[in-house]
Interface confidence: low
């Protein structure tokens, strides 16, 4: 029944890049400029996404596919299909509502995006600190303190409480 009905539907013959134009007795009209239809049988074309401001065009819109955006230098994409651009920070920083801020002591960020994360606590794995952490790099854990010569220290500061990256929306 469904198959029969679709065969009788003149709109089902309209390919991608066109729409079934009710104003023209359901003929297949090409999508107008700055619009597209990615599937056949559409009754309207969708408006092309415009990459403005901090967005820049990665792929132009065509009659059968939407434009794709990315972000201008100094920003990175967020969300499905790069729905937002967010400011980059330097390694050793995180983005807060007051802008880019250095990681607190005991935390690091080795990327231009994201939040500062606590250094690994080597002692939890029964290991000692081989290389100290910095704002940009995590500590490197080495052999357990028992394997070290007497007097060697294994001090890792407690991970500080951090402001979460949860924000909804």
């Amino acid at each position: 029944f469904e198959r029969t009905r679709s065969l009788q539907d003149p709109c089902s013959n309209c390919p991608a890049g066109t729409f079934c134009d009710n104003n023209r007795n359901q003929i297949c009209s090409p999508c107008p400029p700055n619009s597209f239809s990615s599937a056949g049988g559409q009754r309207t074309c969708d408006i092309c996404r415009q990459c403005k401001g901090v967005f820049r065009t990665r792929k132009e819109c065509s009659s059968t596919s939407n434009a794709e955006c990315d972000c201008t230098p100094g920003f990175h994409c967020l969300g499905a299909g790069c729905s937002m651009c967010e400011q980059d920070c330097k390694q050793g920083q995180e983005l807060t509502k007051k802008g880019c801020k250095d990681c607190c002591f005991g935390t690091f960020n080795d990327q231009k995006r994201g939040i500062c994360r606590p250094w690994t606590n080597c002692s939890l794995d029964g290991k000692s600190v081989l290389v100290n952490g910095t704002k940009e790099r995590d500590v490197v854990c080495g052999p357990s303190p028992a394997d070290l010569s007497p007097g060697a220290s294994s001090v890792t500061p407690p991970a500080p409480a951090r402001e979460p990256g949860h924000s909804p929306q």
């Epitope: 967020l78 969300g79 499905a80 729905s83 937002m84 967010e86 983005l95 807060t96 509502k97 995006r113 994201g114 939040i115 994360r117 606590p118 951090r162 402001e163 979460p164 990256g165 949860h166 924000s167 909804p168 929306q169």
Partner: antibody, heavy 121, light 107 residues
Amino acid sequence: QVQLVQSGAEVKKPGSSVKLSCKASGYTFSSYWINWVKQAPGQGLEWIGNIYPSDSYTNYNQKFKDKATLTVDKSTSTAYMELSSLRSEDTAVYYCTRTWEFYYDSVFDYWGQGTTLTVSS
Amino acid sequence: DIQMTQSPSSLSASLGERVTITCKASQDINSYLSWFQQKPGKAPKTLIYRANRLVDGVPSRFSGSGSGQDFTLTISSLQPEDIATYYCLQYDELPPTFGGGTKVEIK
């Protein structure tokens, strides 16, 4: 494509516990926070808490601190919320939703379909 | 916790009419406010974040304004598909808190 698929409806007795799941696919699970939101029948929305799968860091709404426990299993890209000492007022739809790790400009961009929990004797 | 007071709790408007929903925070939340749309039996959908930034793919008839404590969601010309409940959410402080919701119906 990104999907959050939640476990099916549950009917529980008062005083019991329940563990709801939210299985993620189509993205790097460890890079996004999983949030849990409660919606009681005919009521509004309440944020319960969230968890960052990479290191299981959690934040809780104080109101749910003794009610909900959030965990993740990175090997299966699944987030869990266990609700304990169930009471009739825990009857609600519970949603999981993801946000990226940037606090101040983040959006709940994908949601699970919701799990209905009914607590009744 | 920050309290979010949303008004009205419900409204009835004609198709094509301009609709305005307001949200008031109990303290200054900068611009860290989002608006959601929820249709019956469905998960909420984010429309706006940072008070006035439209999420990609959301129709331009939706707009947000305000900062500090007072915020507004405007639908410039109400369409049938806009029938839903709308919620605001502050995320300036943990825990994020939602407004009580505004149910929008067709007159």
